[in-house]
């Protein structure tokens, strides 16, 4: 058993069928020493007298809010919530499994440049009862700060029969250099409660590894003289690291034609313009990605070519 | 030792040529050491990150470009610091700012080089003959070191009387190689915005 | 104590489908998540499929993606295995069993699919 | 396709030292924990050790599980007729969990 805050304490379970569970020790928080008595949740049966309370907890039915008492008045509580651990590894039902880039992926995490600042999102479809807590720092055995708010809910949808829910957090390393060589990853842990269900998730990677840069801006496209042909030209993204001459990008431009089906044309290029072949109908998009550090790509930005 | 935006030299743009053809290079390395060894602790997430250069060079500091010398977070890591702010850059050389960059970049290259040739003569004694090191990657070390023409004492090559314990140098081959993949990417970018200054 | 006792078992032609039914007693069922592993005869044992406590996820071996389907009704403390487009290959003894550290299994149920 | 190798077969006299490997990779055995279970004929399997190394009660004290890296045995000191069966370890894939990962099995004879 441990605390997770004042007054919330965590049972971690062996779960399985039949299982001996834990026995755990309550004390009240008083300087009384006669007439108090027990109760859990709202039930008013008295489940022992005495400063401490000794149980054994093996199921849900076992955990929640045991409260002292004494002639009626209140002296302390303590919310007791179960970590299950099934079969030697800790119960993930509260996210679900984002499965990218691999399985038993339930943080995902991205960066828009090299500042140290980088947004994680989860999914659940769990609607109540939730909360959430996240830190962070850069390396776990001598930690260095990192700054994180609170996790919101971002966006709803729904899959299927189910709604799913995606809550994000944003977090910013305290002192980072734009510039500076990792060799110590970011760690992410976020401690997800769902009524009396305590679980925790963790993610480790490197700012580099997370980046994606904003989609280029500024889009045009120049029609040549006499030809088929058209200039497209955009700008780096606000939100891309400077100076751009050391912290460069490259640059996917696509043709694409009203059908799906329809062979699309890309062209690579380090340059903020391309000139390309404008087909009736189609529309143009470009995209972004580090020049020197393959990391994610960005999202397309697109024009159409009429 | 902060990069002021200066007017490249000449020699420059085969530098710039020659850093490209490194990040690549190494990319490719890292790719097959990856395949390859792949019941070996080997990706990103599996290897510890140690830098051979830690305390010898200070090629992000040493290279810093100018309008990321205001941000302390940059300045802070530095054991020793020429240009500790903007002012006195126009009473430094930039040449000189640029020299002790580029220097401490072929200092880079130059430890690289002898950890990769003594890794590559213990691999080459592996009876499985499992992995090697790219020769077109040693080439190209060689081929950026001569164009950034800066004359060092030749290090000789560690030899080692010990029997080769192949797991831990194919171990150790991968952790390099990553490092010096980040370091080639510091290298590419550097060598970007001096073409561009 | 926990017992888990099989039926549904019996000879079916390929092509043709069965339900395997796994009834849980002496524990909270809808608290475990359960599994359907199998052994061909002669051969060793070979995971088919979980399902969560609460039947949110499932999960299957590719050998039976698309062509078994396993559920679970929490109200009847009971674990199923719909079995469509059967093979000669999935011709095995069928067990049940729970998920955690220290299992129980069913007593094994026999499939035999054959012409 | 078992990712788990056991030997197909080991035996020993009554009283001697019998060991059983199971030979995994590091996203199995190199990252989780390991089970084995007896399975003597027409009979379910039984669970003999949990967690790499724990014996549930009731299991004799003969029977002993240990991991090292990407490999397990199980060590049966002592071994006694009624122990010759067929012997599985079990584990799981960090990419595939919760799917349980079998070994390939391994008879146990008692000469």
């Known amino acids: 058993i441990w605390e997770l805050k004042k007054d919330v304490y965590v049972v971690e379970l062996d779960w399985y069928p039949d299982a001996p569970g834990e026995m755990v020790v309550l004390t009240c928080d008083t300087p009384e020493e006669d007439g108090i008595t027990w109760t859990l949740d709202q039930s008013s049966e008295v489940l022992g007298s005495g400063k401490t309370l000794t149980i054994q907890v093996k199921e849900f039915g076992d955990a929640g809010q045991y409260t002292c008492h004494k002639g009626g008045e209140v002296l302390s509580h303590s919310l007791l919530l179960l970590h299950k651990k099934e079969d030697g590894i800790w119960s993930t039902d509260i996210l679900k499994d984002q499965k990218e880039p691999k399985n038993k992926t339930f943080l995902r995490c991205e960066a828009k440049n090299y500042s140290g600042r980088f947004t994680c999102w989860w999914l659940t479809t769990i609607s109540t009862d939730l909360t959430f807590s996240v830190k962070s720092s850069r390396g776990s055995s001598d930690p260095q700060g990192v700054t994180c708010g609170a996790a919101t809910l971002s966006a709803e949808r729904v899959r299927g029969d189910n709604k799913e829910y995606e809550y994000s957090v944003e977090c910013q390393e305290d002192s980072a250099c734009p510039a500076a060589e990792e060799s110590l990853p970011i760690e992410v842990m976020v401690d997800a409660v769902h009524k009396l269900k305590y679980e925790n998730y963790t993610s480790s990677f490197f700012i580099r590894d997370i980046i994606k840069p904003d989609p280029p801006k500024n889009l045009q496209l120049k029609p040549l003289k006499n030809s088929r042909q058209v200039e497209v030209s955009w700008e780096y993204p606000d939100t891309w690291s400077t100076p751009h001459s050391y912290f460069s990008l490259t640059f996917c431009v696509q043709v694409q034609g009203k059908s799906k089906r329809e062979k699309k044309d890309r062209v690579f290029t380090d340059k903020t313009s391309a000139t390309v072949i404008c087909r009736k109908n189609a529309s143009i998009s470009v995209r972004a990605q580090d020049r020197y550090y393959s990391s994610s790509w960005s999202e397309w930005a697109s024009v159409p070519c009429s | 030792r902060n990069l002021p935006v200066a007017t490249p030299d000449p020699g420059m743009f085969p530098c710039l040529h020659h850093s490209q053809n490194l990040l690549r290079a190494v990319s490719n390395m890292l790719q097959k050491a990856r395949q390859t060894l792949e019941f070996y602790p080997c990706t990103s997430e599996e290897i510890d990150h140690e830098d051979i250069t830690k305390d010898k060079t200070s090629t992000v500091e040493a290279c810093l470009p100018l309008e990321l010398t205001k941000n302390e977070s940059c300045l802070n890591s530095r054991e020793t610091s020429f240009i500790t702010n903007g002012s006195c850059l126009a009473s430094r050389k930039t040449s000189f700012m640029m020299a002790l960059c580029l220097s401490s970049i072929y200092e880079d290259l130059k430890m690289y080089q002898v950890e990769f040739k003594t890794m590559n003569a213990k691999l080459l004694m592996d009876p499985k003959r499992q992995i090697f090191l790219d020769q077109n990657m040693l080439a190209v070390i060689d081929e950026l070191m001569q164009a950034l023409n800066f004359n060092s004492e030749t290090v000789p090559q560690k030899s080692s009387l010990e029997e080769p314990d192949f797991y831990k140098t194919k171990i150790k081959l991968c952790i390099l190689l990553h490092a010096f993949r980040i370091r080639a990417v510091t290298i590419d970018r550097v060598m970007s915005y001096l073409n561009a200054s | 104590q926990v017992q888990l006792v099989q039926s549904g078992g019996g000879v079916v032609q390929p092509g043709r489908s069965l339900r395997l039914s796994c009834a849980a007693s002496?524990?909270?069922?809808?608290?475990?998540?359960m599994h359907w592993v199998r052994q061909a005869p002669g051969k060793g044992l070979e995971w088919v499929a979980f399902?969560?406590?609460?039947?949110?996820?499932?999960y299957y071996a590719d050998s039976v993606k698309g062509r078994f389907t396993i559920s679970r009704d929490n109200s009847k403390n009971t674990l199923y295995l719909q079995m469509k487009s059967l093979r000669a290959e999935d011709t095995a003894v069928y067990y049940c069993?729970?998920?955690?550290?220290?299992?129980?299994w069913g007593q094994g149920t026999m499939v035999t699919v054959s012409s | 396709s078992y990712v788990l190798t056991q030997p197909p077969s080991v035996s020993g006299t009554p009283g001697q030292r019998v060991t059983i490997s199971c030979s995994g990779g590091?996203?199995?055995?190199?990252?989780?924990?390991v089970k084995w279970y007896q399975q003597l004929p027409g009979t379910a399997p039984k669970l003999l050790i949990y967690?790499?190394?724990q014996r549930p009660s009731g299991v004799p004290d003969r029977f002993s599980g240990s991991k090292s890296g990407t490999s397990a045995s199980l060590a049966i000191t002592g071994v006694q007729a009624e122990d010759e069966a067929d012997y599985y370890c079990?584990?799981?894939?960090?990419?595939?969990?919760?799917?349980?990962?079998f070994g390939t099995g391994t008879k146990v004879t008692v000469l």
């Open positions: 069993k729970t998920h955690g550290s220290h299992d129980n």
């Open positions: 002496g524990f909270t069922f809808s608290s475990y998540g």
């Open positions: 399902i969560r406590y609460d039947g949110s996820n499932k």
């Open positions: 590091r996203s199995n055995i190199g990252d989780n924990t």
């Open positions: 967690g790499n190394d």
């Open positions: 079990q584990s799981y894939d960090r990419g595939t969990h919760p799917a349980l990962l």
